[in-house]
Interface confidence: medium
């Protein structure tokens, strides 16, 4: 990466403008403040890739760091990063402005850090002090980030001298945290509510004799303050516990709501955060995905699963072919719905030991005042094949035919095989596959039915075998997405007199 | 009065060559930022390219980039865009736009506008 | 790139009355360090250029009618007629200018009722 000018510190005139150029082999963005400003992105004919950050009437506020990086920096060596510190010095701007968290330094442990007052001038004398105090404290000062050191739990102000005016920055405050020194738990009756609803929560301390709360709300930046209720839980030594009631919420007051807890003997303090969703109206919304199709085994245990969110605590019923399903007192059927969450349920419904009637359409329907939703699917009851039939026969034609009947759903396959060395087969020989068109010696006729009441197929299957010359095992096989059914007959010969 | 007048707009064919010039008037022409935009038929605005005020810096839509050139000429007062190896999708008015911006080179708006120029290309 | 997309493609408003222009772009068009927000508003009549009617989103252009204003922030922009004129039938376009590729809306073509 090149950048123009190469820095790595610029001191820049307020009010001027000032143009910075970043340019690489693959696409380069400027950022400043952990946000892309507007830029402008070029390639050149020689495939170089340029981005031109134009800083116009500069203003103190511009003073910090500027960074050129590749645009995807996916696979990049991390040193693919170029740092500019620009300084704009102005006398109308201090102590450049600090986000609200910088003001505050937790630790939990001792080690250095950095109380980050910065001005837009490197010439300026800038001291650190106690709030309370006039002395400088012995801490050394970098311009472009602060004073480092190892700090006790105080707080801070930087002072400096622009012009004849002397300046002081925020305060910040260091606290070194003991984790285990304070335990706050925060919870709600509801985290979701619908508008005009109450939102109530709780925030309780254990272990503490005095301690000050501190709750923050949507409503209290807008500056509409509520005054939360403080008791103590008799039933438990030193539990004491802040109530904040919003009755009838407005969706305004969706959002984070924290508890800071402060205990001033040691000055250790907690907070805790929950979020607080208020909806217009109340909502029932499927998660996940069902299947339109779904299926059983017969005589096997089914649960079929539909989660939701729903808020307030929705009604949910379940139908077959439009009819409602309940408990039934045999133990057949089964219903549940479980709340797995404060809005997420889980509905199940159970077959117990499936029946073919069991096969239909199934609906679960989860509705309340507000919305409603509802989610269908098909039941197939499988069905393991069997063989219900296999027999031969001698037709006055010659040849010899054997028929195979079975039944199962889904729709059996068929296979027939046959085995011509009776001692060897099928341990040592592999049976040879029958029906096939190419095989001239014997022809294959099939006929499917689907038996509307047991909801199964039935399938025929006839083999005409032309000329049996020596015993054969006929072997024919059902097989379907559940199971598969074997058997086996012997043909002989028309000229031999018994059959094995 | 700011005026902006395209001229050079033709009917080519596929493959083929043209070059836009946009005669300035009203402005200081070398303190400007300027830009060709184009318009298909009943469709909407698409930007083409930009040039910097030094005309140091070039910026080119994906759709054109390699195949126009937009230059500037500070001392005539002029903007060109040269446009080779013309497609059947380069059909369109091409307009001639002053930027807001004054600097080498910043992210700005189109404030004044020329009339547009016709640019056919077709066998 | 950045995407701009309007809504609805096409309106009907009876003189007089309010029109309404949306644009959404597919990432934030707010800088924070200026707190602008990259967005400008062009008017195109048949057979004319395009106009400027509003720039950092909520800008009038020196000429512009006050019955037009822009709003919006960060990544949903809005563009009001506050009182419709006959003269006012046009398409209008948004675009954004926080970096190359600059990209306009699809266009917005406004007639009245």
């Known amino acids: 990466l090149v950048v123009t000018p190469p820095g790595p510190e610029l001191v820049l005139n307020v009010s001027s403008t000032f143009v910075l150029t970043c340019s690489g082999s693959a696409p380069v963005v400027w950022e400043r403040m952990s946000q892309e400003p507007p830029q402008e992105m070029a390639k050149a004919q020689d495939g170089t890739f340029s981005s031109v950050l134009t800083l116009t009437n500069l203003t103190g506020l511009d003073t910090g760091e500027y960074f050129c990086t590749h645009n995807d920096s996916r696979g990049l060596e991390t040193d693919e990063r170029k740092r500019l510190y620009i300084f704009v010095p102005d006398p109308t701007v201090g102590f450049l402005p600090n986000d609200a968290e910088e003001l505050f330094i937790f630790l939990t442990e001792i080690t250095e850090i950095t109380i980050p007052c910065r001005v837009t001038d490197p010439q300026l004398v800038v001291t650190l002090h106690e709030k309370k105090g006039d002395v400088a404290l012995p801490v050394p000062y970098d311009h472009q980030r602060g004073f480092s050191g190892i700090f006790e739990d105080r707080s801070y102000i930087c002072k400096t001298t622009i012009g004849d005016r002397e300046v002081d920055s925020d305060a910040y405050y260091v606290y070194r945290l003991q984790v285990s020194s304070i335990n706050v738990s925060v919870n709600a009756v509801q985290t979701v509510v619908r508008q005009g609803e109450n939102i109530t929560l709780m925030c309780i301390v254990i272990g503490n004799e005095v301690v000050n709360f501190e709750w923050t709300y949507p409503r209290k930046e807008s500056g509409r303050l509520v005054e939360p209720v403080t008791d103590f839980l008799l039933d438990m030594p030193y539990h004491i516990r802040s109530i904040l009631h919003i009755p009838s919420a407005e969706l305004e007051d969706s959002g984070t709501y924290t508890c800071n807890v402060t205990e001033s003997v040691n000055d250790h303090q907690d907070e805790k955060a929950i979020n607080i969703t208020v909806v217009e109206s109340g909502y029932v919304r499927l998660l996940g995905e069902v299947g339109t199709l779904q299926f059983a085994e017969l005589h096997r245990s089914r649960t079929l699963q539909v989660v939701f969110e729903a808020y307030p605590p929705p009604t949910v019923l379940w139908f077959k072919d439009n009819r409602t399903l309940g408990d039934s007192s045999a133990g057949e059927i089964a219903l549940s719905t479980r709340n797995v969450s404060e809005t997420r349920y889980v509905s199940e419904l159970t077959l117990v030991r499936v029946k073919v009637a069991e096969a239909g359409h199934y609906t679960m329907r989860a509705f309340h005042e507000d919305a409603e939703v509802q989610l269908s699917f098909q039941l197939q009851i499988n069905v393991p094949v069997r063989v219900l039939e296999l027999s031969e026969s001698h037709p006055d034609s010659g040849e010899q035919t054997v028929r195979c009947r079975g039944r199962g759903m889904p729709q059996p396959n068929i296979i027939w095989s046959a085995c011509r060395d009776l001692k060897r087969c099928p341990r040592e020989l592999p049976p040879t596959l029958l029906g096939n068109s190419s095989e001239e010696e014997s022809q294959l006729e099939t006929n499917v039915t689907y038996w509307e009441e047991e909801q199964e197929f039935e399938v025929v299957s006839t083999l005409r075998l032309q000329h049996v010359d020596r015993p054969l095992s006929v072997r024919c096989t059902l097989r379907n997405a559940v199971g598969q059914d074997t058997q086996e007959v012997i043909v002989v010969p028309h000229s031999l007199p018994f059959k094995v | 009065e700011v005026q902006l007048l395209e001229s050079g707009g033709d009917l080519v064919q596929p493959g083929g060559s043209l070059r836009l010039s946009c005669a300035a008037s009203g402005i200081t022409f070398s303190s400007f930022a300027m830009s060709w935009v184009r318009q298909a038929p009943g469709k909407g605005l698409e930007w083409v390219s930009t040039?910097?005020?030094?005309?140091?810096?070039?910026y080119y839509a994906d759709s054109v980039k390699g195949r126009f050139t937009i230059s500037r000429d500070n001392s005539k007062n002029t903007l060109y865009l040269q446009m080779n190896s013309l497609r059947a999708e380069d059909t369109a008015i091409y307009y001639c736009a002053k930027s807001s911006c004054t600097t080498n080179s910043c992210p700005a708006y189109f404030d004044y506008w020329g009339l547009g120029t016709l640019v056919t290309v077709s066998s | 790139d950045i995407v701009m997309t309007q809504s609805p493609e096409s309106l009907a408003v009876s003189l007089g009355e309010r029109a309404t222009i949306n644009c959404k772009s597919s990432?934030?068009?707010?800088?924070?360090?200026?707190?602008?927000?990259?967005l400008a508003w062009y008017q195109q009549k048949p057979g004319q250029p395009p106009k400027l009617l509003i720039y950092w989103a909520s800008t009038r252009e020196s000429g512009v009618p006050d019955r037009f204003s822009g709003s919006g922030s960060g990544t949903d922009f809005t563009l009001t007629i506050s009182s419709l004129q006959a003269e006012d039938v046009a398409v209008y376009y948004c675009?954004?200018?926080?970096?190359?590729?600059?990209?306009f809306g699809q266009g917005t073509n406004l007639e009245i009722k």
């Open positions: 040039v910097s005020v030094s005309a140091g810096i070039t």
């Open positions: 990432q934030n068009i707010l800088y924070r360090s200026n707190n602008k927000n990259y």
């Open positions: 675009q954004q200018y926080y970096g190359t590729p600059y990209t």
